[in-house]
């Protein structure tokens, strides 16, 4: 189920790459965030908290990512036209409950000016 399009700027372009921003509520302590391209899982990041508030970050499908207190950024490099597609942030909240899965996304448009290595 697609819950909706992101209500924020999801794609940030720089240096021939793109930062894809996946937000989550900042009260969330344990979650899994997956980046989907179409229906395919490109990246994932799981944050868990153990005893003594020790934080563990795991990735089964690793991408360059950055975690803040209310977002996960996934970075895609060397953009070309094949990157144009629908991208979705698939968030699974574990704690605090209730368990909740949300899917939000948008279409990544690739313009010549955003490509990494334009042929002169």
């Amino acid at each position: 189920e697609i819950n909706g399009s992101a209500n924020y700027e999801m794609f940030i372009f720089h240096n021939g790459g793109v930062q894809i921003l996946c937000k989550y509520p900042d009260i969330v302590q344990q979650f899994k965030m997956q980046l989907l391209k179409g229906g395919q899982i490109l990246c994932d990041l799981t944050k868990t908290k153990g005893s003594g508030n020790t934080v563990s970050i795991k990735s089964l499908k690793f991408c360059h990512s950055q975690l803040s207190n209310n977002s996960v950024s996934f970075f895609l490099y060397n953009l070309d036209h094949s990157h144009a597609n629908y991208y979705f942030c698939n968030l699974s909240i574990f704690d605090p409950p209730p368990f909740k899965v949300t899917l939000t996304g948008g279409y990544l448009h690739i313009y010549e000016s955003q490509l990494c290595c334009q042929l002169k």
Epitope: N7, P25, I27, P98
Partner: antibody, heavy 121, light 106 residues
Framework: QVQLQQSGPELVRPGESVKISCMGS????????MHWVKQSHAKSLEWIGL????????NYNQKFQGKATMTVDKSSSTAYMELARLTSEDSAIYYC??????????????WGAGTTVTVSS | EIVLTQSPATLSLSPGERATLSCSAS?????MHWYQQKPGQAFRLLIY???KLASGIPARFSGSGSGTDFTLTISSLEPEDFAVYYC?????????FGQGTKLEIK
């Protein structure tokens, strides 16, 4: 139906502590976190904090750190909040509220009816 | 801290009229929620995620807005709608409420 039953009114002396309760029914208690909110004439409504029934993790509004302590008893489906070193500024109605999520954020989907705490000598 | 300012503080209208309640945030928030409070009753969730109608809430209630300006609209007031309404933001810590708008019968 889903209900949050709060304990009755409390009259306490300055400097004392009070522990108020919130019992959940009509749903699986451990499947939701619980928030606490203060309502006073001076400050309207203030978010105090939340406790995860699942992990016992707590998240306090910094303003209430050291003033409020949230705990849960899973066996009785009850959340508790203890208020310490009470002053007249702590006189208020305290509400519990069940945590829920939308697509983008979180909110309280069910509230208790409130517990009135009066601090007076 | 994000300050939520509700206006007007009091709104006097008659049943059947349209009510528009505003909530202005001191800085941008991702979403707004709206609650109703009646004397001696528990708060009731009306709108979550800015515009989504909570379960069991009549369709005459609606929410809109983005950034710093949000609105709760009641299209045609019923006698039971006269109460105090609060906006709430949970996207910027510490999470905050507006001071409330009292909707009273004219």
């Amino acid at each position: 139906q889903v209900q949050l039953q709060q304990s009755g009114p409390e009259l306490v002396r300055p400097g004392e502590s009070v522990k108020i309760s919130c019992m959940g029914s009509g749903y699986t208690f451990t499947d939701y976190a619980m928030h606490w909110v203060k309502q006073s004439h001076a400050k309207s409504l203030e978010w105090i904090g939340l406790i995860s029934i699942y992990s016992d993790h707590t998240n306090y509004n910094q303003k209430f750190q050291g003033k409020a302590t949230m705990t849960v008893d899973k066996s009785s489906s009850t959340a508790y909040m203890e208020l310490a070193r009470l002053t007249s500024e702590d006189s208020a109605i305290y509400y519990c509220g069940r945590n829920n999520y939308g697509n983008y954020g979180w909110y309280f989907d069910v509230w208790g009816a409130g517990t009135t705490v009066t601090v007076s000598s | 801290e994000i300050v939520l300012t509700q206006s007007p503080a009091t709104l006097s209208l008659s049943p059947g009229e349209r009510a528009t309640l505003s909530c202005s945030a001191s800085s941008s928030v991702s979403y707004m929620h709206w609650y109703q409070q009646k004397p001696g009753q528990a708060f009731r969730l009306l709108i979550y995620d800015t515009s989504k109608l909570a379960s069991g809430i009549p369709a005459r209630f609606s929410g809109s807005g983005s950034g710093t300006d949000f609105t709760l609209t009641i299209s045609s007031l019923e006698p039971e709608d006269f109460a105090v309404y609060y906006c709430f933001q949970g996207s910027g810590y510490p999470y905050t409420f507006g001071q409330g708008t009292k909707l009273e019968i004219k």
